[in-house]
């Protein structure tokens, strides 16, 4: 039985030309993580593998940086970067856990949650500030 949950940075926004940290966190399971994939819709952005470390897809090498931790930093944001991002945790023995983040890249100089780069860890001001719970799917 899969007991784990993924918390993510949720729905976030950032300014065009800026950078943002995508962060997921798997908890409530003692399954061991063997690999984390980061995907944008159906495109692979990056992989962090227990044995091989980080691999960034060639088409994203200039704008994607690994970390912090198992997170991913997107740089030089464009409006085309708006969309869904997924962190996919491959674990043993549980299987696969997936977390979803929605990023909106704004033209304007005011990005609503542009500074909220990390997983909220304290008290939440309102429902909008609570981290998303991801889903678990066996592989």
């Amino acid at each position: 039985m899969m007991t784990g949950t993924i918390e993510t940075t949720g729905n976030i926004s950032a300014e065009k030309g800026g950078s943002i940290i995508l962060q997921c966190h798997l908890s409530s399971t003692t399954a061991q993580v063997t690999q984390v994939n980061w995907e944008q819709q159906d495109q692979l952005l990056a992989i962090c593998n227990a044995d091989l470390g980080w691999h960034i897809s060639p088409s994203f090498k200039d704008r994607v940086a690994p970390g912090p931790g198992l997170g991913l930093t997107l740089q030089s944001l464009t409006v085309n970067d708006t969309g869904e991002y997924f962190c996919i945790y491959h674990t043993y023995p549980d299987g696969t856990y997936t977390g979803r983040i929605f990023l909106e890249v704004l033209e304007s100089s005011v990005a609503e949650h542009g500074a909220r780069f990390q997983i909220p860890t304290g008290d939440y001001k309102d429902d909008d500030d609570k981290p998303n719970k991801g889903s678990g799917t066996t592989s």
């Epitope: 966190h25 003692t30 061991q32 063997t34 962090c48 593998n49 931790g69 043993y92 860890t121």
Partner: antibody, heavy 119, light 113 residues
Framework: EVQLVESGGGLVKPGGSLKLSCAAS????????MSWVRQTPEKRLEWVAY????????YYPDTVKGRFTISRDNAKNTLYLQMSSLKSEDTAIYYC????????????WGQGTTLTVSS | DIVMSQSPSSLAVSVGEKVTMTCKSS????????????LAWYQQKPGQSPKLLIY???TRESGVPDRFTGSGSGTDFTLTISSVKAEDLAVYYC?????????FGGGTKLEIK
Amino acid sequence: EVQLVESGGGLVKPGGSLKLSCAASGFAFSDYDMSWVRQTPEKRLEWVAYISDGGYNTYYPDTVKGRFTISRDNAKNTLYLQMSSLKSEDTAIYYCARQILLRYYFDYWGQGTTLTVSS
Amino acid sequence: DIVMSQSPSSLAVSVGEKVTMTCKSSQSLLYSSNQKNYLAWYQQKPGQSPKLLIYWASTRESGVPDRFTGSGSGTDFTLTISSVKAEDLAVYYCQQYHSYPWTFGGGTKLEIK
């Protein structure tokens, strides 16, 4: 150069409490998972606590669960182990050890601090 | 919990000799998804803290002399020192990091004749 320096050990009576610290330097502390591992007087090694890089996950073996709490302050590059309800069998050298993300072996160890639980 | 058993508990060899020590786990340490054995070897010299020698059962840590070799898969593992030096006097521990709680073997004490 990676350095892990433990402190806080000492003599404690059974049932007592103690907090150990581990000061890290020479590497990006917040990029690594950390653990405490102890070595008993019989020289056996026992893993006692784990904390993930950002402090979101903590794990313990059943022998210390509910009595020990691991924590970290990434701003201060310091790892902690709060121990309570101490028993004579907790007597050991306590090492803090570094772990690379997604790898669960211990690639660097501190020099250790000694805890003695005795009346 | 996975039980790690090491043998022999101690052995004495002369400088230049080849030495082999074994580590057995109570269940397989091989992940089928990445074909990696989640086993490490450590060296602890007298008065010092443990030092990582080998991980993934056979990958030598940076800076470790090539006379140290790890091998094995599943439940049976071996650490071999091809030509022992006086500085190899130590206790050698294996550790599984396949599943919680992570556990260590009881150690093999290497003495020099």
